[in-house]
């Protein structure tokens, strides 16, 4: 009961520290409730960046203080992570869980390496 999850290998954040990527999953059943989680992995340490549960056909809802936003279309989730700094460069993994109806499925993407470059400060103009 493995579920395949696909995501891009590499993404470059823009100058405002925002990175977007698509997480696509091959659903083995007709899920009506899906949970999507973005995890950051450094070596064997995994931390949760953000998570959202949504009903198929509805919008993703992240917590108000989340750095993530997203939209869904079928088995695709478009994820955006904001407020990234150079120190946040790393491997971001998309995890998809089919929460309802049973049985429960979980799939893990191979991860998207997000590169973040802090913008150079503007020189003072006299």
């Amino acid at each position: 009961k493995a579920m395949h999850v696909a995501q891009p290998a590499v993404v470059l954040a823009n100058s405002r520290g925002t990175a977007s990527f698509v997480c696509e999953y091959a659903s083995p059943g007709k899920a009506t409730e899906v949970r999507v989680t973005v995890l950051r992995q450094a070596d064997s340490q995994v931390t949760e960046v953000c998570a959202a549960t949504y009903m198929m056909g509805n919008e993703l809802t992240f917590l108000d203080d989340s750095i993530c936003t997203g939209t869904s279309s079928g088995n695709q989730v478009n994820l955006t992570i904001q407020g990234l700094r150079a120190m946040d460069t790393g491997l971001y993994i998309c995890k998809v869980e089919l929460m309802y109806p049973p049985p429960y499925y979980m799939g893990i993407g191979n991860g998207t390496q997000i590169y973040v470059i802090d913008p150079e400060p503007c020189p003072d103009s006299d």
């Epitope: 989680t37 064997s44 995994v46 993994i93 869980e97 929460m99 309802y100 429960y104 979980m106 893990i108």
Partner: nanobody, 120 residues
Framework: EVQLVESGGGLVQPGGSLRLSCAVS????????FTWGRQAPGKGLEWIAT????????NYVDSVKGRFTISRDNANESLYLQMNSLKPEDTALYYC?????????????RGQGTLVTVSS
């Protein structure tokens, strides 16, 4: 928001007992398999036990069979692990996790863990 919160860990002498609890919120507890696992100091994650939604099917790793018992209370959305005849090698951080054994990994939806130390 899905949350799993473990409790009940502590320091216990060899041969002693502990009962771990896991309070689950943010999901329909009664329709999912749940799992207990652990990570000993300097070691990888180890699956311990899984229970199905109705609580009538359980599976255990050989090293804890006959000593540990997994149970659940669907009404109170809680999972338990009764640990008897504890050994020093049971010292670990214990986690409860959503889903069956095959999904227990560093990526599993799980709690922060509760520390069990078995020492005289």
């Amino acid at each position: 928001e899905v949350q799993l919160v473990e409790s009940g860990g502590g320091l216990v002498q060899p041969g002693g007992s502990l009962r771990l609890s896991c309070a689950v919120s943010g999901l329909n507890f009664g329709i999912y398999d749940f799992t207990w696992g652990r990570q000993a100091p300097g070691k990888g994650l180890e699956w311990i036990a899984t229970m199905n939604p109705d609580g009538d099917i359980t599976n255990y790793v050989d090293s804890v069979k006959g000593r540990f018992t997994i149970s659940r209370d669907n009404a109170n959305e809680s999972l338990y692990l009764q640990m008897n005849s504890l050994k020093p090698e049971d010292t670990a951080l214990y986690y409860c996790a959503l889903g069956p054994e095959r999904y227990f990994s560093i990526y599993a939806t799980r709690g922060q863990g509760t520390l069990v130390t078995v020492s005289s």
